[in-house]
């Protein structure tokens, strides 16, 4: 055992020594603006090697439909950039708000600016004097004062201004030792909100040319968040260049420039007024459908599914799968380039869903005596790091004309009750159709959406009496015609779960 452990350690050291030397970035301290031109960045080379090995191993053995090894049999992840052709320019003293859904590449963008993630293409220009506030607040053992000053020379006026702007005065006044109260080991425990404010204060206290604030308000209540955004980000730091990762519409309104990321690409770049001028595209893409609130909960889920899969369901005539969609969110201004394919062509975009069993586990706050029938439904829980552990996920969902093998198998299992025997799914007959209207329809569920997608190709009418063999024939796989796509998050989740 010791021998194997030693070998493992030696291999790790060897791998480390063989890596490329870390290149310290060259900065120009006279630079006043922050510029990113056509920046594309990939995950480090180790991931690519791992995929090559996995694919080789997989080619050496035959895979069946349900085999776990199928995971590596059909994908195109080797060249998946975490950021694709990103452009922006902000002048000294401006605020750039970076928005986007989970996994869009917001933090990766900051990592590229800091030099933690090396771009494969493009240019980045800034002075190099950076202060960073992580979305995960951290505290070092020591006093509150030490945690904020953090080795920087002490300036009483600056320190007091930061304490006030970050709403820490009231918290500090509660302690007899004031800001000399010890935190961490042997000291007091702070709330998530207090830790977040101290982390922000630390970043703001440091003198820098560029402040990178990665979702600093995540653990703050809406009133505190609003006050700190105004007093700290907008007033105290008014003459500083700031890049704020945020999802709040209120913050976007106050920003000089807005960059919205989606799956690593630039979905929109410009000012808030330019964003508003994109009506009605603005409301349809960012806000969904206006008449949404008159629909039942189940209908909403159906519309959600439809919104996320805007392809040939929207017309009766068959649509070419390579057809380019309407260009609505073009980058405006200086970098007015065409949007990336993943945005233009939703077919190639990957959507991650959670199909979770509705149990008290996922429903914080539901009374135990709730007698609602069990049902499968689309989980709308955001894909957050903290919440991921309790949310079992379907690895891949492909929006191509032919569903991926895994997706088909899960739908097959769902329809034939093989996943949950005790579940009684009453379904209405769904005829083959291409058009999903937005008019309210009774009891339309995700199953109906799946059924439509299946029947779209086969013309098969699925009724309550399902012949399993007939159904299996509809799920026949022509592996070569299946577009092989997944996401980095899926891959990383897989590696995390299956690492030895």
């Amino acid at each position: 055992q010791t021998w194997y452990d030693s070998l493992g350690a030696i291999n790790k050291i060897q791998d480390f020594l063989q890596k490329q030397e870390y290149k310290t970035l060259e900065y120009n301290l006279t630079t006043t603006e922050v510029v990113m031109e056509n920046v594309t960045a990939f995950w480090e080379e180790g991931f690519g090697e791992l995929f090559e090995k996995a694919k080789q191993n997989n080619n050496n053995r035959k895979t069946s439909n349900g085999d776990d090894s199928l995971f590596f049999s059909n994908f195109s992840l080797l060249g998946t950039p975490v950021l694709k052709d990103i452009n922006f320019k902000i002048e000294r003293g401006q605020l750039l708000a970076v928005a986007g859904s989970t996994g869009a590449g917001k933090t990766s963008l900051l990592m590229v600016i800091m030099g933690e993630l090396e771009p494969s293409e493009g240019k980045i220009k800034h002075s190099g004097r950076i202060s960073f506030c992580s979305q995960f607040s951290w505290i070092m053992p020591g006093t509150i004062k030490e945690n904020i000053i953090f080795g920087v020379s002490y300036d009483e006026y600056r320190y007091r201004s930061v304490i006030k702007a970050c709403q820490l005065e009231e918290d500090i006044s509660k302690f007899a030792e004031k800001d000399n109260i010890v935190l961490g080991e042997g000291g007091i425990t702070l709330s998530g909100g207090q830790r977040a404010r101290i982390s922000l204060a630390r970043a703001v206290y440091k003198d820098a040319d560029l402040y990178l604030l990665d979702s600093p308000f995540g653990y703050l209540d809406v009133l505190t968040e609003k006050e700190i955004f105004e007093s700290c980000v907008c007033k105290l730091m008014a003459n500083k260049t700031r890049i704020l990762v945020t999802s709040k519409m209120e913050h976007l309104k106050k920003a000089d420039k807005i960059l919205i990321l989606h799956e690593g690409s630039s979905y929109f770049y410009g000012t808030f007024s330019e964003l508003q001028n994109l009506q009605p595209d603005f409301s349809s893409k960012l806000m969904g459908c206006d008449s949404f609130d008159q629909f039942s909960a189940e209908r909403r889920n159906s519309i959600l599914t439809e919104t996320l899969h805007r392809f040939s369901l929207e017309g009766d005539a068959p649509v070419s799968w390579t057809e380019t969609k309407k260009q609505s969110f073009k980058q405006t201004g200086e970098f007015g380039e065409k949007r990336k394919n993943s945005i233009l062509n939703p077919i190639n975009s990957i959507r991650k869903f959670s199909i979770v069993q509705k149990t008290p586990l996922q429903m914080n706050g539901i009374e135990e005596d709730s007698d609602e029938p069990l049902e499968r439904r689309l989980s709308l829980v955001p894909d957050s790091e903290q919440g991921e552990a309790i949310l079992p996920r379907i690895s891949v969902i492909s929006t191509g004309p032919t569903l991926q093998a895994r997706r088909r198998q899960s739908v097959l299992n769902l329809m034939t009750h093989s996943v949950n025997q005790g579940q009684n799914i009453h379904r209405k007959t769904t005829a083959s159709t291409r058009k999903v209207s937005l008019a309210p329809q009774a009891n339309l569920t995700e199953l109906d959406i799946y059924s439509r997608r299946l029947s779209q190709e086969t013309g098969l009418e699925i009724s309550e009496e399902i012949n399993e063999e007939d159904l299996k024939e509809c799920f026949f796989d022509d592996m070569e015609s299946i577009p092989a796509v997944t996401t980095w998050n899926t891959y990383l989740r897989y590696i995390t779960v299956h690492k030895s």
Epitope: G192, M287, P382
Partner: nanobody, 121 residues
Framework: VAYLQESGGGLVQAGGSLRLACVAS????????MGWYRQAPGKQRELVAF???????NYADSVKGRFTISRDNAKNTVFLRMISLKPEDTAVYYC???????????????WGQGTQVTVSS
């Protein structure tokens, strides 16, 4: 657009309990932070409790140990269980939800109309 509707407020004696609920309806893709805030006459609105999308909770010092916040993501609802109520808990209780309307992830703040909670001594 989303709409928030609070319920569960009312008159209760000191030491009693209440359970507030707030349901969001309308165009909802997902909801991030949810919270309860209160405003007593002549005072500013203040935090009671809030819960993140990951289920992490935060409470005002004055209600710790007495109030419990929880959420039902499937029903877009946030609850506030209040026990050992005190006369100083008397206020209008407002619900807040940070609603995301579409897949791009932009977040909009919505507030309920408020529900009166009166604790008599």
């Amino acid at each position: 657009v989303a709409y928030l509707q609070e319920s569960g407020g009312g008159l209760v004696q000191a030491g009693g309990s209440l359970r507030l609920a707030c349901v969001a309806s309308g165009n909802i893709f997902t909801i991030n932070n949810m919270g309860w805030y209160r405003q007593a006459p002549g005072k500013q609105r203040e935090l009671v409790a809030f819960i993140t999308s990951a289920g992490i909770t935060n409470y005002a010092d004055s209600v710790k140990g007495r109030f419990t916040i929880s959420r039902d993501n499937a029903k877009n609802t946030v609850f506030l269980r209040m026990i050992s109520l005190k006369p100083e808990d008397t206020a209008v209780y407002y619900c807040h939800q940070a609603v995301v309307h579409g897949p791009i992830g932009l977040e909009y703040d919505y507030w309920g109309q408020g529900t009166q909670v009166t604790v008599s001594s």
